[in-house]
């Protein structure tokens, strides 16, 4: 029976600027139930507070809602496990929640083949930003990337269609059924989910560009 | 206790390239942004560019934009910098340096001494 | 790119006595999210840069209480109050509020 391992804090993401949450990794629980605490203070603070929500994120999580958040603020945080033989403490993690976002999905995924009479025929698409994301107020940027794929095939083709929110792809097998995806980050984010697949059948007379 | 390990020094003839590796170890590689910087003998800092090794996006300073490519081997916690068409101007000491959840970084490496010389 | 501009390039200090550095902007470094993204590094003879000073005037963990920063806008200052032995070496003021991140040339701080 020994102290438990120190814990580390490995996550951290909010899906709009206005909560996040981070988790922790228990270190070695030295054969004895351990408890852990998450205690946490703003710059040019020096109040230590608890973790307001330990419950919303899921196991080893803390959840900061609004009233806990501040983009102003880098939040600085660590974590105590504590058992019968002792405590130890993870390092001090540093936090700013502009640099931790991870957005939802895009939004109303449309595709659609165009066949101009005077160009090459190409497939078009085109989505919304997830709505959680203000990008009014200019200082988030959204990333995209697109990824395709005939219904039967194994590989994803993909593209990145930086910060428009239309695409055109030339190149595409006549006939084919494909499946059509988008996903999106901020410059200094994370990447969201992809959004659900849309389907689209390429006529089989889509003539194929070189 | 964060720790990021870089490889030794090099000597490189002009025109030649440069990869230099950044060994993490003690916490978990794929969390935090990993930046590269180089200092040339005498002179100040010089950012060349960073990389999220979570996905292996990156961004990079305009100025080595196509001469310096980041990577990451998620296995081996490993971020390497590779520099190409080498100029004796590209002498200096380059060092990787970590970030928190922040664009700010605390953690630097020892640092890696290339000189380029004919 | 912004450009940092520091004063002075060297500055030779009794022990006990304060020092101060600045550094100019060429252009505002507050982000569009209204963080200011400025820092001071410290490289001390034969060593990497450490980070002492975060965002114009937190101190990072471990940082003496004697290192301070202030300023606002494109002007800011690192303050010593009683420069110790230890406080030798390059002094980088550094900015991440627009790509690429830059640094200042440096200010030499000795002992007398």
């Known amino acids: 029976q020994l102290p438990p391992g120190k814990p580390e804090i490995f996550k951290c993401r909010s899906p709009n600027k206005e909560t996040f949450t981070c988790w922790w990794r228990p270190g070695t629980d030295g054969g004895l139930p351990t408890n852990y605490s998450l205690t946490y203070h703003r710059e040019g603070e020096t109040l230590m507070h608890e973790c307001p929500d330990y419950i919303t994120g899921g196991p080893n999580s803390c959840h900061f809602g609004k009233q806990y958040t501040s983009m102003w603020r880098t939040y600085i945080m660590m974590v105590n496990a504590t058992n019968q033989m002792g405590s130890s403490f993870s390092d001090e993690l540093y936090v700013d929640v502009t640099y931790i976002v991870q957005p939802d999905p895009p939004l109303e995924l449309a595709v659609e083949v165009k066949q101009p009479e005077d160009r090459k025929p190409y497939l078009w698409i085109k989505w919304s930003p997830p709505t959680l994301i203000d990008l009014k107020t200019g200082w988030f940027t959204l990333l995209y990337e697109i990824r395709l794929k005939p219904e039967k095939a194994a590989e994803w083709e993909i593209h990145f269609a930086g910060q428009q929110t239309e695409f055109k792809i030339l190149s595409l097998h006549p006939g084919q059924k494909y499946l059509v995806q988008v996903r999106c980050k901020p410059d200094h984010g994370y990447w969201s989910a992809w959004s659900p697949a849309t389907f689209i059948q390429i006529p089989s007379d889509f003539t194929m560009n070189d | 206790e964060v720790q990021l390990v870089q490889s030794g020094a090099e000597v490189k003839k002009p025109g030649s390239s440069v990869k230099v590796s950044c060994k993490a170890s003690g916490y978990t590689f794929t969390s935090y942004w990993i930046h590269w910087v180089r200092q040339a003998p005498g002179q100040g800092l010089e950012w060349i560019g960073e990389i999220d090794p979570s996905d292996s996006y990156t961004n990079y300073n305009q100025k080595f934009k196509g001469r310096a490519t980041l990577t990451v081997d998620k296995s081996s916690s490993t971020a390497y910098m590779e520099l190409s068409s080498l100029r004796s101007e590209d002498t200096a000491v380059y060092y990787c340096g970590r970030s928190f959840f922040t664009n700010w970084f605390a953690y630097w490496g020892q640092g890696t001494l290339v000189t380029v010389s004919s | 790119d912004v450009v940092m501009t520091q004063t002075p390039l060297s500055l030779s200090v009794t022990p006990g006595q304060p020092a101060s550095i600045s550094c100019r902007s060429s252009?505002?470094?507050?982000?569009?999210?209204?963080?200011?993204?400025l820092h001071w590094y410290l490289q001390k003879p034969g060593q990497s840069p450490q980070l002492l000073i975060y965002?114009?005037?937190n101190r990072f963990s471990g940082v003496p209480d004697r290192f301070s920063g202030s300023g606002s806008g494109t002007d800011f200052t690192l303050k010593i109050s009683r420069v110790e032995a230890e406080d030798v070496g390059v002094y980088f003021c550094?900015?991440?509020?627009?790509?690429?991140?830059?640094f200042g040339g440096g200010t030499k701080v000795e002992i007398k």
């Open positions: 550094s900015q991440s509020t627009h790509v690429p991140f830059t």
């Open positions: 965002k114009v005037s």
């Open positions: 252009q505002s470094l507050v982000h569009s999210n209204g963080n200011t993204y």
